[in-house]
Structures are given as structure tokens and as C-alpha cells.
């Protein structure tokens, strides 16, 4: 039950996180005009990964896309790439995790396969979250650098008579959305990985011991109700009575010095 809850919660948290990463990537407010030196501006500038916008105090907003690819800063391209990779990995992770959910039955899918899929999606979510956090952090670092550079030459003009105030940009809402979303995706991924451990059985060193009696044989597997904490693929926690020397739900059998025949 705890495993199902952890897996379900991990899925929901990751879903919210990836939705946030998509939202952040699409948002226009990655950087917003710093109003500290000009709080009474009648024109407000803000920029996203895909376009820059100007909102006039009259209420009119004009946005212009970055219609060039080669003319854009390499850092901006890198941020775009990180966010897109994060979205793609997250989307694939979501698709995989849907099929991995313990509460969803798909044909005769083995629990071992679900465990593997849960682990895969968990890793994808972790990488997706890291991509988003990295992308947002790179952009934030770029902003901080540019902010202090523009502060250094804030006012230029002729003999101090005419002031040209250089527009400085600070953190926009999208950065905070991106950081939170990336964090949520990361947490969701970790939860999926933890759930995977619970879904998979522990490999035991004790193999099935066969007791041959006249009439019919019973194979008894010790620890048939053991807790599922390992990364092994046997998830059918039940006693087997099949009369054979091997249990039918052993997927892999490794020789061991503790094997008894």
C-alpha cells in the first residue's frame, strides 16, 4: 500500500513539475525590467526564451519573436535546449510511469516489468528536473552578470546634461516557476525510484528446497511472504506448490554455495 502511495504521489508530483517546466519554458517573463532606478516608467519591458515584450502603461502590449537563430546568444540557445530536453525527458517519463503504476492493470504485465519501468521513469524525472534547474540557473546567472555590467555604466550622456538610462533586467516570474517545477520533478523522480525498490523483491540466497514425498510432491519456498525491498524482479509474494524442484515464479536462478537439493 505504501509502495502504491509513494509511486502514485511521485507520479502526481512529477506531473505537476513537468507542467510547470512547460509553463516556464513558454512564459514571456524570464527577465523583467528592473524598476529600482525608474519606478515611474510608463513602458515596461520583459523577455522570454522565445520573444521579448513591451507593455505600455496605456495597457497595450507588443511582443516580438526572436526570428533569428544564429544571432541569438549561445547561452540563450543553451537554456532553450536544456528546457526542451527537460520537457521531452519528462514527457517520456510520464508516459512510461503511467504504464508502471501499480494501480493500473495492463494485460498480464509482470510486477518486475513495472518495477523496471518505475525506475526508468524515476531516472527520467530526475534528469528532467536537473535540466530545468540547470537551464533556469544558467539564465539567472546570465541576468546577474548583465545586471552588474549595466549598473557599471548606468548613466551615459553629454557632460551629465542629458541622461540615457540603460534598461536593466532582473529575475522574472518564469525563473521561480522553473526552479520550483524542476524541484518538484526531481522530488517526483526520487519518489518513483524509492517506489521501485518496494515493487521489486529482495534476492534471497536460499533457493527452493524440494521435499519429495510419495504420492505428490510439494515445493516449499522459504520466505514466501518476505517484504519486497530489493531490486530483483520477482514480485509474486506467494507460496508455490507445484511439485517441482524449482518454483515457477523464479525468473532468474543463480548458483549459490547455499543451494540445497
Amino acid at each position: 500500500m505504501a509502495v502504491t502511495a509513494c509511486q502514485g504521489l511521485g507520479f502526481v508530483v512529477s506531473l505537476i513539475g513537468i507542467a510547470g517546466i512547460i509553463a516556464a519554458t513558454c512564459m514571456d517573463q524570464w527577465s523583467t525590467q528592473d524598476l529600482y532606478n525608474n519606478p515611474v516608467t510608463a513602458v515596461f519591458n520583459y523577455q522570454g526564451l522565445w520573444r521579448s515584450c513591451v507593455r505600455e502603461s496605456s495597457g497595450f502590449t507588443e511582443c516580438r519573436g526572436y526570428f533569428t537563430l544564429l544571432g541569438l546568444p549561445a547561452m540563450l540557445q543553451a537554456v532553450r535546449a536544456l528546457m526542451i530536453v527537460g520537457i521531452v525527458l519528462g514527457a517520456i517519463g510520464l508516459l512510461v510511469s503511467i504504464f508502471a503504476l501499480k494501480c493500473i492493470r495492463i494485460g498480464s504485465m509482470e510486477d518486475s516489468a513495472k518495477a523496471n519501468m518505475t525506475l526508468t521513469s524515476g531516472i527520467m524525472f530526475i534528469v528532467s528536473g536537473l535540466c530545468a534547474i540547470a537551464g533556469v540557473s544558467v539564465f539567472a546567472n546570465m541576468l546577474v552578470t548583465n545586471f552588474w555590467m549595466s549598473t557599471a555604466n548606468m548613466y551615459t550622456g553629454m557632460g551629465g546634461m542629458v541622461q540615457t538610462v540603460q534598461t536593466r533586467y532582473t529575475f522574472g516570474a518564469a525563473l521561480f516557476v522553473g526552479w520550483v517545477a524542476g524541484g518538484l520533478t526531481l522530488i517526483g523522480g526520487v519518489m518513483m525510484c524509492i517506489a521501485c525498490r518496494g515493487l521489486a523483491p529482495e534476492e534471497t540466497n536460499y533457493k527452493a528446497v524440494s521435499y519429495h514425498a510419495s504420492g505428490h510432491s510439494v515445493a516449499y519456498k522459504p520466505g514466501g511472504f518476505k517484504a519486497s525491498t530489493g531490486f530483483g524482479s520477482n514480485t509474486k509474494n506467494k507460496k508455490i506448490y507445484d511439485g517441482g524442484a524449482r518454483t515457477e515464479d523464479e525468473v532468474q536462478s543463480y548458483p549459490s554455495k547455499h543451494d540445497y537439493v
Partner: antibody, heavy 118, light 113 residues
């Protein structure tokens, strides 16, 4: 077509208050900022302040030191400008004007002459 | 506050001749975000409210004759009437539309010589 119709001329004593109205028609009143601008006889234009009728947000020119209050009644599509503690130098024609793209005033009222005289 | 200075105070031009009005702002009106200059020009005839001519320093409002043109960037702007007509006799004002408080120039009176 867009029309801004202002209230009639007023004569006030120093220290009194005046409230000028501006009725808008021909557009969505709540969606555009309404500005007030004044012009003293033979002088230039001076911006007083503005209101966004949609949410009542206002901005004022600091030169009026809290003497001015701009309000709007969306149900009547009317904006109001009240100026208190009147002085003789407040004698002017007061205009309302719609705020438009480029932060310009594209439509103006006909003006209201406010005379402050003892 | 941004101070708008217009020159000359008055201008007498013959009909059909070019009239040029200058406007200087104490601070740049160029917005880096869209590379537009937030300067507006108005025409005011006696006994009438001002009429919008040009916004964004060079964009003519609808219905404004093409003999009116605006130019300039940053702090220095010009309104040009390429061929003065009798109906162009008026006072012309420039306005800072970039920073609050919104401020106007002192005006330039255009007359016929």
C-alpha cells in the same frame, strides 16, 4: 464613434473644491485609462493624473500634492476629477483624454473652464 | 521629471513652405525593448482640444495628412510640415510618453507669413 463629453464651466472661490465630469461613449470605457490634463489661459498643457476604470487604479502628478482625486463610475461610463483647496493659479481649462497605444491621448473632451476667483 | 523643451516658441512660414519644429527632452525617450521613442506630437487650434498627430516619434495617427512627419531619436526630435496649409495654423506640442509624470513641451505657435 468615440466621444468624451465634459460638464459645464465652473466658477469657484479660493479654498473650495471643484468636481469635473467626463462621460465617455463609443468604446469600452472600462478597458482604457482616462487622463486629465489642464491648460492655464495662454499656457501649455499639464498632465494631472489618470484612472483605469476597470479596477479603479490611479496615477497622479506629484505637483498636485494630494489635492486631486480621480474616480470613475463604470455603470455610467463617466470619469470624475476633483480638485480641492483651489487657488487662483488653478484657473484653467480641464480636459479629459483617453489613453491609447504609444501612451498618447487619442481622444479629448471639449474642455471645462474652471475659474477660481474671490 | 523629464523636461521637454520646444523651439522655436513661434514660427512664421509661407503657404506651401516647410515648417520644422524641434523638441528636446532632458532624458532619452528611446525604449530599448522595442527600439521605439516614446514621444508624441499634438496640434491645438484656438478654442479646441489638442489633436493627436504623431506617436512613437514617427507614427502618424489615422487620418493625419502625410505632410506631417516626425523624426528623431533619444533626446532630439523634429516635427516637419512639408508643405504648410492654411488649416495647419495652430500650436504644436510634444509630449514625453516614456516616464511619469507625462510632461509636455511649452508649445510652438505656427503662423502664416
Amino acid at each position: 464613434q468615440v466621444q468624451l463629453v465634459q460638464s459645464g464651466a465652473e466658477v469657484k472661490k479660493p479654498g473650495a473644491s471643484v468636481k469635473v465630469s467626463c462621460k465617455a461613449s463609443g468604446y469600452a470605457f472600462s478597458n482604457y485609462w482616462m487622463n486629465w490634463v489642464r491648460q492655464a489661459p495662454g499656457q501649455g498643457l499639464e498632465w494631472i493624473g489618470q484612472i483605469y476604470p476597470g479596477n479603479g487604479d490611479t496615477k497622479y502628478n506629484g505637483n498636485f500634492k494630494g489635492r486631486v482625486t480621480i474616480t470613475a463610475d463604470t455603470s455610467a461610463s463617466t470619469a470624475y476629477m476633483e480638485l480641492s483647496s483651489l487657488r487662483s493659479e488653478d484657473t484653467a481649462v480641464y480636459f479629459c483624454a483617453r489613453y491609447y497605444r504609444g501612451n498618447c491621448f487619442d481622444y479629448w473632451g471639449q474642455g471645462t473652464l474652471v475659474t477660481v476667483s474671490s | 521629471d523629464i523636461v521637454m523643451t520646444q523651439s522655436p516658441d513661434s514660427l512664421a512660414v509661407s503657404l506651401g513652405e516647410r515648417a520644422t519644429i524641434n523638441c528636446k527632452s532632458s532624458q532619452s525617450l528611446l525604449n530599448s525593448g522595442n527600439q521605439k521613442n516614446y514621444l508624441t506630437w499634438y496640434q491645438q487650434k484656438p478654442g479646441q482640444p489638442p489633436k493627436l498627430l504623431i506617436y512613437w516619434a514617427s507614427t502618424r495617427d489615422s487620418g493625419v495628412p502625410d505632410r506631417f512627419s516626425g523624426s528623431g531619436s533619444g533626446t532630439d526630435f523634429t516635427l516637419t510640415i512639408s508643405s504648410l496649409q492654411a488649416e495647419d495654423v495652430a500650436v504644436y506640442y510634444c509630449q514625453n510618453a516614456y516616464t511619469y509624470p507625462l510632461t509636455f513641451g511649452g508649445g510652438t505657435k505656427v503662423e502664416i507669413k
